[in-house]
């Protein structure tokens, strides 16, 4: 109930937790041989620190938090990685041809720490 | 602003072929597929097959395979749907729509065109 | 038939709530989005809700949409007159691809 306590980044604007997007070919995510389109794709991936109860997913990452400021060097801090994904349909190559095939947890769609 | 243009509505008989067009406006038609859409009279919505512009592949849905045929031109901006053979159960409204960034959803949709076939 | 069901019909008063629902799959909505599509009369669908509860700009927050298990739903609160429309929930099936409900006429009672 406690949790996502949090929104205001300690570290400055655009430093903690948030939701980036990368634009990316096929090659460069290494997909050239299986996927045929897109053949770009607006990445969107979660990066930035996760300082003291910022966008904390639950109770566990606040404890996390509270023993990361006791314990620095035996337990990390909190990492910032998707809470929900957005589905991507993909058109890919097929032994018969193409198809196409849809993937629930490609795309993030928002931002926690954990 | 994105828009999608189609073609006007036409009166065929059995037997004839047909091709529609939809014309795309307002964004880079290569970078978005194009889905086809039938709408019977009265009835509701089914998806008849995907292109993709920018490279010219083509994915039907099962009901549709080898019915229709869906083509690109991307040097004018436009899909296709074509019939060689039609049949008096083509009778509908058909929609190009775009989809989405994600491919998932269709989020700008053509006027649509009434296609009527009666001997 | 279609894969997704829905009611073929729903009313209310102006100012009312109503929800819309959408009924599937383990194989559809149970793993995936669901998107709705309002289509006024004599006009093309138009998207109002994707992956699920997402608002495209120009749609009215009075359109609300959610998914629990296998099925999804749609909420229009304070009806208006001209929300009298057909609505159509679709998702993805892993065998027919794109896959759209059977539609529900909205009726807004004088």
């Known amino acids: 109930a406690r949790a996502r306590n949090g929104d205001h980044c300690p570290l400055g604007p655009g430093r903690c937790c948030r939701l980036h997007t990368v634009r990316a070919s096929l090659e460069d995510l290494g997909w050239a041989d299986w996927v045929l389109s897109p053949r770009e794709v607006q990445v969107t991936m979660c990066i930035g620190a996760c300082p003291s109860q910022f966008r904390a997913a639950n109770m566990h990452a606040q404890i996390k938090t509270s023993l990361h400021r006791l314990k620095p060097d035996t337990v990390p801090a909190p990492c910032c990685v998707p809470a929900r994904y957005n589905p991507m349909v993909l058109i890919q190559k097929t032994d018969t041809g193409v198809s196409l095939q849809t993937y629930d947890d490609l795309l993030a769609k928002d931002c926690h720490c954990i | 602003e994105v828009q999608l243009v189609q073609s006007g509505a036409e009166v065929k008989k059995p037997g004839e072929s047909l091709k529609i067009s939809c014309k795309g406006s307002?964004?880079?038609?290569?970078?978005?597929?194009i889905g086809w859409v039938r709408q019977m009279p009265g009835k509701g919505l089914e998806w008849m097959g995907v292109?993709?512009?920018?490279?010219?592949?083509?994915i039907y849905s099962p009901s549709f395979q080898g019915q229709v045929t869906i083509s690109a031109d991307k040097s004018i901006s436009t899909a296709y749907l074509q019939w060689s053979s039609l049949k008096a159960s083509d009778t509908a409204m058909y929609y190009c729509?775009?989809?989405?960034?994600?491919?998932?959803?269709?989020?700008?949709w053509g006027q649509g065109t009434l296609v009527t076939v009666s001997s | 038939q279609s894969v997704l069901t829905q009611p073929p019909s729903v009313s209310g008063a102006p100012g009312q709530r109503v929800t819309i629902s959408c009924s599937g799959s383990?194989?559809?909505?149970?793993?995936?989005?669901v998107n709705w599509y309002q289509q006024l009369p004599g006009t093309a669908p138009k998207l109002l809700i994707y992956?699920?509860?997402n608002r495209p700009s120009g749609v009215p927050d009075r359109f609300s949409g959610s998914k629990s298990g296998t099925s999804a739903s749609l909420a229009i609160t304070g009806l208006q007159a001209e929300d009298e429309a057909d609505y159509y929930c679709?998702?993805?099936?892993?065998?027919?691809?794109?896959?759209f409900g059977g539609g529900t006429k909205l009726t807004v009672l004088g």
């Open positions: 729509a775009r989809y989405g960034r994600y491919g998932t959803y269709f989020d700008y």
């Open positions: 307002g964004y880079s038609f290569t970078s978005y597929w």
């Open positions: 292109i993709d512009p920018g490279g010219s592949y083509t």
């Open positions: 383990s194989s559809n909505i149970g793993v995936l989005y």
């Open positions: 992956s699920n509860d």
């Open positions: 679709q998702s993805w099936d892993s065998s027919s691809n794109y896959v």
